[in-house]
Interface confidence: medium
């Protein structure tokens, strides 16, 4: 490699630091906040990016009912604890001993506790729901042309196998985007459907995690596509547990 | 300094192949995806083709899927488009760019481009 080749980056985290230490000289990025070596061939793990977050300077209805166990992330950011893989560990505590059990996307799914609170495994999201809402426009969007496009999106942006996009709804002005992933279908290199729902997430709120990329142009059929609210459920495998029933949207 | 280097066009039979390389230097080559757009005689940018950076993927524009390949050799930092059996309406200047994935080309958001290649097909 040239030496013009030193000042190496990652093109899908931004909030990496690189340098060309790697095995045969070659280019080596590390989350910031972590320093874990990350693979930027592919998206990198949603705690790693939000331990790199915390880690920054602060600055007739066609329609999904989400079910009564659907989690929706109240409790916004924090500094995640994560395992030498990249994965959330099951429990979080922050700094005043305070503790509770995330699921795989590092959303709670208990009540809160103290360090005697234990989280016996790391429970997969299996089922995720985006739920947008689009801003005013001329007329409604086709539906197939809509469902091709955003699946075509987290095909190629986001590198998630087609299989994963269990369905998009679409009734004027939501949208649903389903992502469905067992355990027994997520094969070694496939990208985590937790981790294409955050880089989504960014990129509609105009936080794109790639490097040198302007915001996400999202159109169908050359219209702009807008969103102007997000919302996201959390399905786990196995339910959540939290002492009173809670409200869901 | 960033750059690539686009070769390999010229004139063409109807029906006839060429092959375009692009040469890569000044970045990570083999951690970016590439693709190649051309720009035909007073017209727009047409995206033409998209790689993954370690090739396992790629993408066509229809006007091209069965006739043009893409292809890239990370040791050589080098992209290529195998272009064949093509026809008048492919003549244009065809560029490099660099771009994490095929939807880029929505987005118009390429870091780096080529100075580009012309490709004239005529009898």
């Known amino acids: 490699h040239t030496a013009a080749q030193d000042n190496c980056t990652c093109p899908t985290n931004k909030m990496t630091v690189c340098s060309p230490d790697g095995p045969g000289g070659r280019c080596q990025c590390r989350a910031l906040g972590s320093g874990m070596a990350v693979d930027c061939s592919t998206l990198t793990s949603k705690c790693l990016l939000l331990k790199a977050r915390m880690s920054a300077p602060k600055n007739a209805r066609t329609l999904v009912r989400p079910s009564e166990h659907a989690l929706v992330d109240n409790d916004g950011l924090y500094d995640p604890d994560c395992d030498p893989e990249g994965r959330f560990k099951a429990r979080q505590c922050n700094q005043t001993s305070v503790c509770w059990c995330v699921n795989s996307v590092g959303v709670r799914r208990t009540d809160k506790g103290d360090l005697s609170l234990r989280c016996d495994e790391l429970v997969r999201t299996h089922h995720i729901l985006i739920d947008l809402r689009h801003r005013p426009t001329a007329g409604a969007f086709n539906h197939s042309d809509l469902d091709a496009e955003l699946r075509r999106l987290f095909r190629e942006r986001y590198r998630l196998h087609p299989k994963f996009v269990a369905a998009v709804h679409y009734e004027q002005p939501t949208i649903q985007i389903e992502l469905r992933q067992n355990t027994s279908q997520k094969a070694a290199g496939d990208v985590d459907i937790g981790d294409a729902a955050y880089y989504f997430e960014r990129d509609i709120k105009g936080e794109s995690l790639f490097q040198g990329r302007g915001g996400l142009d999202l159109r169908v059929r050359g219209e702009p596509l807008q969103v102007e609210r997000t919302l996201i459920y959390y399905l786990d495998e196995i339910p959540p547990k939290f002492s009173m029933k809670r409200l869901t949207a | 300094e960033v750059q690539v280097v686009e070769s390999g066009g010229g004139l063409a039979q109807p029906g006839g192949s060429l092959r375009l390389s692009c040469a890569a230097s000044?970045?990570?080559?083999?951690?970016?995806?590439m693709s190649w757009a051309r720009q035909a005689p007073g017209k727009g940018l047409e995206w033409v083709s998209g790689?993954?950076?370690?090739?396992?993927?790629?993408y066509y524009a229809d006007s091209v899927k069965g006739r043009f390949t893409i292809s890239r050799d990370n040791a050589k930092n080098t992209l290529y488009l195998h272009m064949n059996s093509l026809k008048p309406e492919d003549t244009a200047l065809y560029y490099c760019?660099?771009?994490?994935?095929?939807?880029?080309?929505?987005?118009?958001?390429?870091?780096?481009w080529g100075q580009g290649t012309q490709v004239t097909v005529s009898s």
């Open positions: 760019a660099q771009g994490y994935s095929d939807y880029d080309r929505r987005v118009g958001g390429y870091d780096y």
């Open positions: 000044g970045f990570w080559f083999s951690t970016y995806a």
């Open positions: 790689i993954y950076a370690d090739g396992s993927a790629t």
